[in-house]
Each structure stands twice: as structure tokens, then as C-alpha cells.
């Protein structure tokens, strides 16, 4: 079923509950909020990039096959290596590879530009989301998605990579982000926190939400996720935020009521083909967009980023489940898998819609103090 | 643990027909897709068809298009094979697999000859 | 029909490394799976995603896939290992979706 969100008029942040005021000091992030990963940004751009993998598992993928008319994807994970012994897929499938940047985890030793030297990148995801500095971009047309309403048959592969929950995705999942910036899905995961702590990956204006979901594609430019890591552009994750509504989200429930199978990590099972939009907001028109980077080692830039300004509601009993049912690396419950907001480093967040007009009463003037830098596409 | 068990074969004769039965148990039946495999003596493993987790769909090989049926009853975590018009080149042992990608677990077979 | 060419028979001497190919076109865009059938038994999944190993195989058992073919390499081979092996695909291009190698009998000298 489509989620009901918030208030169509008014930015994300407000959360859909309506309420007036700004966010108090809860809602920042905290030490206990985020995982003590330290991601120091650096001078710029390290090489090493391209070797590995990242986003949870990135899938790499296979040159298109033919007769399928669409890639192959895998997991690559950069967590783990695609096969433990070895594994590459649709290769969106492989969730254990690059073994040289498989042993990170959230928190703790390595620091991750140790593991990736791209983590310590200038132009770092996730971000904070500040609405009022974000630039008005007209040019942002609404997104276009074709062929994300899957049959049950060919069933998915959903695996718990020791890091996230991963659904690889089969060929044919076609988005647009606009005209000729086409990408191919490859896979979706989900960020969390545990319980009464908040996870999403993203923050607006400080503001951590419950949980948030990530489908991640390749630009049809690239054959292989490895061709395109680093480059402007060749990988794009759509994120939107998940928070908590009083009804069950029946969507979500096809994975989530999945995940004691795959409690262990490493282990993963076989779930129907679903429509992959409904896991989405219903408003593919009012988004936020900028440039950064895959969130897990390699932490490859020239990542597209769209976060829906609408959110996704589940049940706190589904919440729940997301947070409290997956075990990772070392007899450690699989919680809190965000890393730290980076800084913006001069980057500019487009929006599009009037994001910086504030809506309510109590606005005099519309504020939007940065320009739409894509102003004559 | 996962447990498939085929159960039905038998000599039948050409024309005829024969239900093979699956009986499913150490896992949730209605979760997962249902394959049929078949093997000639002697011969490679052959795709018969498969069934979505809650029977809405299936797809069969072209030689036994409009003579055979899947079907399945998730209350009573049992998978059938409905095989009608019966020729001699059907015979083989049939399995029955959990997975439409790929099949995880296989049940041990059942015989199924067809000969006047 | 998509076809799955497997050699019929690959001999190995005890501890040496054997290589079953599955040959297909353009099949390293597809996702390839092996399966181990004995004398009188079910087939085995030993390998799925083009190389992934299910739990209880060892891990002398690996797989890969690109171009026009996929292979099974059984490291350090044993007398236990003699056996049939399929590749399998998913075709989602034609009717017959899933589709199996012929299948290549590994005898251990």
C-alpha cells in the first residue's frame, strides 16, 4: 500500500506528525546516535577507488546479456568479498567480494581510509539536508521508473551481508533521472538503528529518521559497477527515508517478514519478485539531489544521491523487526548501520521544488539562498 | 530440516494419467517457489516446470505444455504434479526442488514409467 | 531453446584440480549454478550465483563465469567427487526459464 507522508507542502524534516515546532536537541545526532566511525575528509580525491566495491554490496555488474536484454548484477561487497571465495554477479549478486576491503565494520577499528583511501574524500555521503539552503532547480524533472514491478517468478536473492539487508535485483529495472541520465537498479538495502535510536544514513536539518532504504543503480553508460565507481555519474541511489505510521506497510512486510531466515549473518534466502516502486514515496517529483559518494568502503564519489523529500511509513512493529531481528559480524546484533554525516565541502543540495519556502504561518519572506546550479539544463 | 518427499509414481500406460505428490516440511511452504525436475535413465536432468509461491503462476517446458498441471495446497505444504496423456518418452524419475532461480533442496525422486 | 554446453566426461587424477565448463552464449551475464549428482542419488547444489557455495561444501569446490563460459573448479580432488555435474541458468527470454547443462561425468582415476 502507498504510504501517506507528510504534508505535501512542507520540506522534509517536519516529520509527518504535523508538528509545529523546530527540531529540539533530540533529534541531533548524538555519539550514541552514530557509530564512531571517523571518516576525516581529506585534500581531495585518493585513488584506489575502483578496487573496490561498496554501498553495502555493490552488485557488480555483467556485461548486458543479449538474450536477457538487461545486466547481470552481484554483490560486490566491500565488506566482504564476493564469494567468500569468491563471487561477482548480475552480478548484482555477489555479496562477497574484494576481500581487500571486506573487513570493515561500523565503528571501530580500521578507520575506513585505511580500508579505502576514498573515505577520506572531499565530497563524502550521507549528508545533512538543510532545506532552507538547498537551491531550487527547476530543471529536476520527476523521476521515471520502468519495469520495478516485478512477478514472483524469477525469485530474489535477500542476504544478510554481516552490514545490511540486500535485495539483489534482476535486469530490466530501468530509472531515469532525467533526460539521457539513465541508470539500470542493482540493488536495495536498508540502514537502521536499534531500538529508541534512530538509523537513517541521511539527516535534514540534524534530524535522524528511523530507518532509510537504498536502491542503488548504474548509470547505462557502464557496463560494470567497477567501470563506474568514481565516476561522475555512473552510480545513482535513490534514498528515502523510513519512519514510523500506524498502520503496516504490506510492501516492506514481503522482506521483512523474511528476515528471521536470514538472521545469521552471511546467510541469505530466496523471496517473490514484488513491486519494487511501492517500497518508495508515492511523489517521485519532490526530491532532494547532489553529489557524494558510496557509504560504505570504497566510499567511491561521483555518486548521484536523490532523497525523496516524502518519507516511507512502517508499522513500529516493522521498525522493530528491521532493527532487532539481523545478527552481524561477531555475535553483534546488525543495528546503528549508518555512518556519520559528512560535511558538504562547498557542495550545494538541489531540490525540486521550493524546498528553502517555508511554508507555514510564520514565514514573512521565502528564504533560498543558493542558486539552482543546473539552471540551463 | 528441509524434507521433500515425492511420492505417486508408477507403470502407467500411454495416454493415461498419474498425480505425483511432494509433501514439504521443515521450512514455510507458502514462502518459497516449487520446481518439477525430471531424469530419464541414463539421461540429464531435465526442467518439467516450476510454481510461484502462491500458485498464481507457472511456467512448464514446451513438450509438456497442455498435458501437465502444477499446482500446490499451502495448507497442507504439498506440491502436485498433474500428468495427463502420458507418452513413453515422460518416463523418468521426477523430483521435486524448493527455488525457481535455483534449487536449494531436491526431494529424493519418484519413478514414473510409461510403457504399453 | 538456450543451450548449455558441458563436455560429457573431464578425468582427473586423486588430488589434482579438475575444470568443468558450461558454454553459453554470452552466459557471463547470467547467473550460473552447479549441481553434483551421484549414482542413485538427488542432485547436490554446489554452487550458486556463479560461485557461491552453499553451507556443508567444501571449499575445494569454486566456480566463475564471464564471456561465453562458466566453470567449476574442484581443487585437490577426491575419489568422493566422481559424479555428474549440471550447470543450470535462469532464461527469463524464453519459455523455458530454467535450463540445464548436459551434464559432464567426472571420474577420478
Known amino acids: 500500500q502507498r504510504l501517506p507522508r507528510m504534508q505535501e507542502d512542507s520540506p522534509l524534516g517536519g516529520g509527518s506528525s504535523g508538528e509545529d515546532d523546530p527540531l529540539g536537541e533530540e533529534d541531533l545526532p548524538s555519539e550514541e546516535d552514530s557509530p564512531r566511525e571517523e571518516d576525516p575528509p581529506g585534500e581531495e580525491d585518493l585513488p584506489g577507488e575502483e578496487d573496490l566495491p561498496g554501498e553495502e554490496d555493490l552488485p557488480e555488474v555483467k556485461p548486458k546479456s543479449e538474450e536477457e536484454g538487461s545486466l547481470k548484477l552481484e554483490d560486490l561487497p566491500t565488506v566482504e568479498a564476493p564469494g567468500d571465495p569468491q563471487e561477482p554477479q548480475n552480478n548484482a549478486h555477489r555479496d562477497k567480494e574484494g576481500d581487500d576491503q571486506s573487513h570493515w565494520r561500523y565503528g571501530g577499528d580500521p578507520p575506513w581510509p585505511r580500508v579505502s583511501p576514498a573515505c577520506a574524500g572531499r565530497f563524502q555521503s550521507p549528508v545533512d539536508i538543510r532545506p532552507q539552503l538547498a537551491a531550487f532547480c527547476p530543471a529536476l524533472r520527476p523521476l521515471e521508473l520502468l519495469g520495478f514491478q516485478l512477478p514472483p517468478l524469477p525469485e530474489l536473492r535477500l542476504r544478510n551481508n554481516g552490514h545490511s539487508v540486500q535485495l539483489t535485483l534482476p535486469p530490466g529495472l530501468e530509472m531515469a533521472l532525467g533526460p539521457g541520465r539513465e541508470y539500470r537498479a542493482l540493488q536495495l538495502h536498508l540502514h537502521w538503528g536499534a531500538a529508541g535510536r534512530p538509523g537513517s544514513e541521511h539527516t535534514v536539518e540534524g534530524h535522524r529518521f528511523p530507518a532509510e532504504i537504498h536502491v542503488v543503480h548504474l548509470s547505462t553508460a557502464f557496463a560494470r559497477v567497477d567501470e563506474a565507481l568514481g565516476r561522475p555519474g555512473g552510480l545513482a541511489v535513490l534514498a528515502a527515508f523510513l519512519e514510523e505510521g500506524p498502520e503496516e506497510n504490506s510492501a516492506y512486510e514481503q522482506l521483512l517478514s523474511r528476515l528471521e531466515e536470514i538472521a545469521e549473518e552471511g546467510s541469505e534466502t530466496q523471496v517473490p519478485g514484488l513491486d519494487i516502486s511501492a517500497l518508495l514515496p508515492s511523489d517521485f517529483s519532490r526530491y532532494f539531489q547532489y553529489e557524494g559518494s558510496l557509504t560504505t568502503p570504497p566510499c567511491a564519489q561521483g555518486v548521484i544521491w536523490t532523497v525523496f523529500n516524502q518519507t516511507v511509513m512502517l508499522s513500529a512493529k516493522q521498525l522493530h523487526t528491521l532493527s532487532d531481528t539481523l545478527w552481524g559480524p561477531g555475535d553483534s546484533r546488525l543495528q546503528l548501520n549508518f555512518r556519520a554525516t559528512q560535511p558538504l565541502n562547498g557542495r550545494v543540495i538541489e531540490a525540486s521544488f521550493p524546498a528553502g519556502v517555508d511554508s507555514s504561518p510564520r514565514a514573512a519572506e521565502p528564504v533560498q539562498l543558493n542558486s539552482c546550479l543546473a539552471a540551463g539544463d | 530440516q528441509v524434507t521433500l518427499k515425492e511420492s505417486g509414481g508408477g507403470v502407467v500406460q500411454p495416454g493415461t494419467s498419474l498425480r505425483l505428490s511432494c509433501a514439504a516440511s521443515g521450512f514455510t511452504f507458502s514462502n518459497y517457489a516449487m520446481t518439477w525436475v525430471r531424469q530419464a535413465p541414463g539421461k540429464g536432468l531435465e526442467w518439467v516446470g516450476l510454481?510461484?509461491?502462491?500458485?498464481?503462476?507457472?511456467h512448464y517446458t514446451d513438450s509438456v505444455k497442455g498435458r501437465f498441471t502444477i499446482s500446490r495446497d499451502n495448507a497442507k505444504n504439498s506440491l502436485y504434479l498433474q500428468m495427463n496423456t502420458l507418452r513413453a518418452d515422460d518416463t523418468a524419475v521426477y523430483y521435486c526442488?524448493?527455488?525457481?532461480?535455483?534449487?536449494?533442496?531436491w526431494g529424493q525422486g519418484t519413478l514414473v514409467t510409461v510403457s504399453s | 531453446l538456450p543451450v548449455l554446453t558441458q563436455p560429457p566426461s573431464v578425468s582427473v587424477a586423486p588430488g589434482q584440480t579438475a575444470r568443468i565448463t558450461c558454454g553459453g552464449n554470452n552466459i557471463g551475464s547470467k547467473s550460473v549454478h552447479w549441481y553434483q549428482q551421484k549414482p542413485g542419488q538427488a542432485p547436490v547444489l554446489v554452487i550458486y550465483y556463479d560461485s557461491d557455495r552453499p553451507s556443508g561444501i567444501p571449499e575445494r569446490f569454486s566456480g566463475s563465469n564471464s564471456g561465453n563460459t562458466a566453470t567449476l573448479t574442484i581443487s585437490r580432488v577426491e575419489a568422493g567427487d566422481e559424479a555428474d555435474y549440471y550447470c543450470?541458468?535462469?532464461?527469463?527470454?524464453?519459455?523455458?526459464?530454467?535450463?540445464f547443462g548436459g551434464g559432464t561425468k567426472l571420474t577420478v582415476l
Open positions: 510454481i510461484s509461491y502462491d500458485g498464481s503462476v507457472t
Open positions: 543450470q541458468v535462469w532464461d527469463s527470454s524464453s519459455d523455458h526459464h530454467v535450463v
Open positions: 526442488a524448493r527455488g525457481s532461480g535455483y534449487q536449494e533442496h
